[in-house]
């Protein structure tokens, strides 16, 4: 497969348009190299239709005039201005604003809780398997295997802190060296970025929103993957992370600190612990080859236990099995010895839904996975809707300017670094990079934050999660302090190295360009987002894992040709875009390859065949639910079915017409009506003041 889904001519062509969300779009300068192009064979067709006589706005736009899809949308304010309202209107508007704020905080709370439960669900479904990944002895000698184990385990348990704590306990008990642990930590860093990518998938309903959200989420993935791509070979060759962190750990006489403050958990834990509570020690025990742990359930049953350490007399086959010669005796028939036993007495059961069901972990995990994804999706939809209604006009302008504007010259370059600090600080407060980046995703989607601004915030989040780990390490007991601190520092310096690689010089901000490219592809072929997720977080790691188990020879035998092909394609791509003249005519574009190797169109047809039937059913269901909801809330005009259905109808009608952005309309109310956003009759009741 070629590296980009649509590969036409390499030369810039003003007549070619991007395959974007709203049909044909013009190529933006520079960005065209990153985005997908149409094939030579398919020329864009612009349809011009006559408009209804009442409209003075031109709905059909000339292809050349359409804005860059990455420009933030202007969230229009159709409401009455504050100054024009009477007292009653102002009071009503104030209370509406307060109500929206409460709702927003409520949905945000359940959004974070559902992320926590999603993590628990993943641990129940794949936690034991994740633990078994760690018990593989090849980790010690194969850094690539360590890396993919880090990715797989973190993806399976949906928590980098769980996977790193397993690594720490393994290093503390000498089952793993720090050197072998570093690739695992790098993998954990990659694995943790899946959460916000899943969250971005929830915004699949609106193409342009999804484009931004998915790109905003995957900028994290690309940063991590690219950092590993460069830093893992550097670490294997030089062991710089191991050496630096060892020097730091040895030069400081650290005293055991206090636990990192649990700020967000304090609020979410009372709710999440009513849903499910897990005994996370089980995964660590499996990782450390504890046979008994394999049969233990991850679902915590007893929350209050009394542990009593006693010495009991036990019979042994012979005196050779005695604890020590002095603790050995006979009763004349059997040999006895004294054994230290920890007697655990169960006092009180946990108070959560699954405590008395005695279901297998897989069943509980599956139930929670479905429920948490539904809640996550629901909360996300509501957050986006509320933010959409709040962030209009003046409010939106202020927020967008505050977040996305740079400092005045000559300090503009500092803005990004401040964003990194903000990201680190926010992550430290919420104690989870997944929560922070997942909360950021819908904001990128609705256009409050640009990807360029989200990037440093995400990098800061990566730093924030490592500072939390350092604090947690300082709170470790004596025997684990050194190893946990060194691993936390490795994680910290790995992220710092990554930032130094992919942030300071604008040219090196490859993750942004790659994420935008993927955003464009995923906006057109939305199934590709799921495909990307499966490939990058499951198939590639699992393939490397399988090949590594087969041995170095097999891994090199398969890996080297694959890497060679990738490098060859990348070089060819670079030459095609930079200096195509040096290439033979045939290689100046990808047309020499069959269509399925250079375009996603044939694949799209296959996927569409499979999903078409399901999509139709889904839309029918959606309409029924939607209408029922409208009847209940007594507003027959309020119902707009999901975007997926509209797109489906569009596809069936064969309308591939670029529509003007709302801000180009003369009559705002008409424009919003035309787009189906607001019923004309209800437009005057919109309240935007918060």
């Amino acid at each position: 497969m070629a590296p980009w889904p649509e590969l036409g001519d390499a030369q810039p062509n003003p007549d070619k348009y991007l395959e974007g969300a709203a049909g044909q779009q013009p190529t933006a300068p520079d960005k065209s190299k990153e985005t997908n192009k149409t094939d030579n064979t398919e020329a864009p067709v612009t349809k011009i239709e006559l408009l209804p006589s009442y409209s003075t706005a031109t709905l059909i736009d000339e292809p050349t005039e359409v804005d860059d899809p990455w420009n933030l949308p202007t969230l229009q304010d159709s409401g009455i201005k504050w100054s024009e309202r009477d007292t009653k209107g102002k009071i009503l508007c104030f209370f509406q604003g307060i109500g929206r704020l409460i709702l927003l905080l409520g949905f945000l709370y359940f959004f974070v809780c559902s992320l926590d439960i999603l993590s628990s669900a993943f641990q129940l479904v794949g936690g034991k398997m994740a633990g078994q990944f760690f018990s593989n002895s090849s980790i010690m000698s194969n850094p690539l295997l360590g890396l993919v184990i880090g990715v797989l385990v973190t993806v399976l348990v949906q928590s980098s802190s769980t996977s790193t704590s397993i690594v720490v306990s393994m290093v503390s008990s000498s089952l793993l060296t720090v050197r072998a642990a570093i690739p695992i930590i790098m993998g954990a860093n990659i694995g943790t970025s899946i959460t916000n990518t899943i969250v971005a998938l929830m915004q699949v309903g609106d193409r342009s929103e999804f484009r931004r959200a998915f790109a905003g989420a995957t900028v994290h993935d690309f940063f991590n993957w690219l950092s590993v791509l460069v830093l893992l070979p550097v670490e294997v060759a030089t062991h710089y992370l191991e050496i630096i962190t060892q020097l730091i750990v040895e030069s400081f006489h650290f005293k055991n600190g206090e636990d990192a403050p649990d700020l967000l958990k304090v609020i979410t834990k009372p709710f999440t612990k009513l849903i499910v509570q897990l005994d996370k020690k089980v995964i660590s025990q499996i990782a450390m080859n504890d046979e008994k742990a394999k049969n233990k359930s991850l679902v915590k049953i007893w929350c209050k236990t009394f542990t009593n350490k006693t010495q009991i007399n036990v019979t042994v086959p012979s005196t050779a099995n005695c604890t020590s010669p002095s603790l050995c005796w006979t009763d004349g028939i059997q040999n006895w010895t004294m054994k230290n036993v920890t007697y655990k007495e169960n006092i009180a059961k946990c108070q959560h839904i699954f405590v008395n069901f005695h279901l297998p972990d897989l069943a509980v995990g599956t139930i929670l996975l479905i429920l948490s994804l539904l809640v996550l999706c629901g909360c996300l939809i509501m957050i986006v809707k509320i933010l959409g209604s709040v962030l209009k006009g003046q409010v939106a302008t202020v927020i967008k300017k505050t977040i996305n504007t740079d400092f005045p010259f000559p300090f503009a370059w500092l803005t990004g670094y401040l964003a990194i600090l903000v990201g680190a600080g926010m992550t430290f407060i919420v104690q989870s990079s997944s929560v922070f980046t997942s909360a950021l995703t819908p904001l990128i989607g609705i256009g409050v934050i640009t990807i360029e601004r989200a990037y440093p915030l995400t990098l800061g989040s990566n730093i924030g999660t490592t500072t939390t780990a350092i604090l947690a390490a300082l709170a470790s007991p004596g025997n684990a302090l050194r190893s946990s601190l060194q691993i936390a520092l490795c994680h910290f310096f790995f992220n710092i190295s990554g930032i130094l690689l992919w942030y300071p010089i604008p040219f090196t901000r490859l993750p942004i360009r790659m994420a935008k490219g993927l955003g464009n592809i995923s906006a057109k072929y939305r199934w590709f987002a799921v495909f990307y997720l499966i490939i990058f977080f499951f198939l590639i790691p699992l393939t490397v894992f399988g090949l590594s188990l087969a041995g170095w020879r097999v891994l090199v035998g398969v890996g080297v040709p694959v890497v060679f092909i990738i490098i060859l394609v990348l070089c060819l791509r670079l030459l095609q875009s930079r200096c195509p003249r040096v290439l033979p005519k045939k290689l100046q574009n990808w047309n020499f390859l069959p269509l399925w190797m250079r375009s996603l169109k044939p694949w799209d047809a296959v996927v569409s065949k499979f999903t078409g039937c399901f999509q139709m059913r889904c839309c029918c269901c959606c309409r029924v639910c939607c209408r029922a909801c409208c009847l209940l809330c007594d507003c027959p005009k309020c119902c707009r079915c999901s975007k997926c259905c509209e797109d489906l109808e569009e596809a069936q009608e064969g309308q591939d017409v670029p529509v003007k952005a709302p801000e180009t309309f003369d009559n705002i109310t008409i424009s919003r009506e035309a787009q189906g956003e607001v019923p004309a009759s209800d437009s005057k009741t919109e309240c935007t003041a918060l």
Epitope: N313, T319, S326, C328, W329, T330, D331, G332, I333, Q334
Partner: antibody, heavy 119, light 107 residues
């Protein structure tokens, strides 16, 4: 209270066998080992072996192996010790003693049975 | 087999005296040692087990100490009924063995 009542004195000829009984009462018979210890006239104590009435498991002192057999009858809470191929040096007082659970100290002893071996 | 050697074999003492009897094992027996008292014509009676633990009903004047290979039985204040033969026994390994005994007589 715990009581161990042994059978009466026996006089045996060399080469013969002797079977001494020990009836236990006052405790759960099957939980404690029953040891047999002998004491030759004017000599010290010598452990012969033990039986666990619960399962019938036995352990003998190598010195007596092949000559001594310990059995039990749980219905009557009685333990038997049979010593075959008697010799004159087997003349001694034979004691049964109940062993404390889990270790080899003997907390309660029978009154003893004098076995005299003479031609 | 583990040998136990008691010393002295004979001991003369008066009522009220403090008496110490020692027992040496040929190898480490931990604390798996018991002490018995036997009066003429009677069965032995358990005094101490686990080297230091007094059996129920045994007067407090009897005490045991030691671990490994050296053990002692101490009678803090001799009473008339204490004149008897004392045996140490190990139950560290089979066969169980007894010391040769220490005869305590009235001076």
């Amino acid at each position: 209270q715990v009581q161990l009542v042994q059978s009466g004195a026996e006089v045996k000829k060399p080469g013969a066998s002797v079977k001494v009984s020990c009836k236990a009462s006052g405790y759960t018979f099957t939980t404690n080992n029953m040891h047999w210890v002998r004491q030759a006239p004017g000599q010290g104590l010598e452990w012969m072996g033990a039986i666990y009435p619960g399962s019938g498991a036995t352990a003998y002192n190598q010195k007596f192996k092949g000559r001594v057999t310990m059995t039990r009858d749980t219905s009557t809470s009685t333990v038997y010790m049979e010593l075959s191929s008697l010799r004159s040096e087997d003349t001694a007082v034979y004691y049964c003693a109940s062993g404390m659970y889990g270790h080899g100290a003997m907390d309660y002893w029978g009154q003893g049975t004098l076995v005299t071996v003479s031609s | 087999d583990i040998q136990l050697t008691q010393s002295p074999s004979f001991l003369s003492a008066s009522v009220g005296d403090r008496v110490t009897i020692t027992c040496k094992a040929s190898q480490d027996v931990g604390t798996a040692v018991a002490w018995y008292q036997q009066k003429p014509g009677k069965a032995p009676k358990l005094l101490i087990y686990w080297a230091t633990t007094r059996h129920s009903g045994v007067p407090s004047r009897f005490s045991g100490s030691g671990s490994g290979t050296e053990f002692t039985l101490t009678i803090s204040s001799l009473q008339p009924e204490d004149f008897a033969t004392y045996y140490c026994q190990q139950y560290s390994s089979n066969p169980l063995t007894f010391g040769q005994g220490t005869k305590l007589e009235i001076k």
